[in-house]
């Protein structure tokens, strides 16, 4: 953690990825783009899918890949969870096929952690209308994160992604 420069987060400058619940990122992204301008150009090509409305999570998912969340305390970008990816893929892959294209390899769901936990940090997304949330009664903003287990005080509720994320400064098992 000696290199301050290494952990610096940058404001998200991509309009379609603003107001999604986090506002800073760190390049390179999960596809390897070094510049937000390259990520933005690629992101905007997905407009037809977003407009089609195949999944309410699609925009958040794409943004979490192309401009992943950054925190000053952890040296790696926080992208989407595999579960959100699979949910989006299930809804949007048939539509993409209608457009004549296959699901992109860069969005291969096996590349993302299955779920957000102590070993892998990821964003589980804002919850899809037709897909039940994993909790029988969803945690409301401001509630404590008891569902994550014994170390619930190490987590904080993130409104946009509707799930508990490890607070800055706690070891997520990323370096073990």
């Amino acid at each position: 953690f000696g290199d301050e420069e290494e952990r610096r987060c940058d404001p998200i400058r991509i309009s379609m990825c603003q107001n999604l619940g986090y506002n800073v990122t760190k390049m390179p992204n999960l596809v390897g783009h070094e510049l937000q301008t390259d990520a933005e150009l690629q992101l905007t090509t997905f407009t037809p899918l977003i407009q089609y409305g195949c999944s309410s999570q699609l925009q958040f998912f794409l943004c979490s890949v192309y401009v992943p969340m950054c925190t000053e305390k952890i040296n790696i970008p926080i992208g989407p969870c595999g579960g959100m990816c699979l949910s989006v893929k299930r809804r949007c892959e048939p539509v993409l096929k209608e457009f004549g294209f296959a699901w992109p390899e860069s969005l291969n769901c096996s590349k993302f952690p299955p779920q957000n936990d102590h070993n892998h940090m990821c964003m589980e997304g804002p919850g899809d209308e037709e897909v039940p949330l994993p909790h029988k009664t969803p945690i409301q903003p401001g509630e404590e994160c008891h569902s994550v287990g014994t170390n619930s005080d190490q987590y904080i509720w993130v409104k946009r992604s509707l799930n508990c994320v490890l607070k800055c400064g706690y070891d997520a098992g990323l370096y073990s």
């Epitope: 390897g32 390259d38 690629q42 037809p48 457009f99 004549g100 294209f101 860069s106």
Partner: antibody, heavy 118, light 107 residues
Amino acid sequence: EVQLVESGGGLVKPGGSLRLSCAASGFNFGIYSMTWVRQAPGKGLEWISYISGDSGYTNYADSVKGRFTISRDDSKNTLYLQMNSLKTEDTAVYYCARVGPGGWFDPWGQGTLVTVSS
Amino acid sequence: DIQMTQSPSSLSASVGDRVTITCRASQGISSYLAWYQQKPGKAPKLLIYAASNLLGGVPSRFSGSGSGTDFTLTISSLQPEDFATYYCQQTYSTPWTFGQGTKVEIK
């Protein structure tokens, strides 16, 4: 059938202006990103400009930046390329193309020839 | 800018031949690569996208492979209608750039 038809090409003097049009049909034009690509006589392909489906994002190759402007009128299903301060090296066939998710160009229009000469 | 280098620049082949065209990117582009076919006086047509995905309606004798910096377009058994110029293109980083083209001629 998805179709793109360019028009507006012709002979123009160096320093002059021209506006190319690309009429789209057979698909929901308003949600797709679009692009312009050119090909000088006997040469390869050069990408020159891009516009997102909502017109909120545009991008240009350095060779045309500041001189060319891409725009669209979704009510007319038409893409435009306004070309100012034309140079002899802008002589080319200009193609418009639809951009699919991921950045792939499909289909392309038949092209329109722009000749810049004194 | 990312430079795309195709080889060979041209090749002569006979109907039924297996033809391979390579495309090298000056830096990694993941699988953000497309292949286009262009016949004289006509617009280019998309054949393969995302390095290895065949566009619907394109004959299965065409195939693409590669990731990162090295990519290949293969025509397993050349047909008379395949004589054309082929271009690779990267859409990973702006400006989006094309290779210089490979002309496939009749031997």
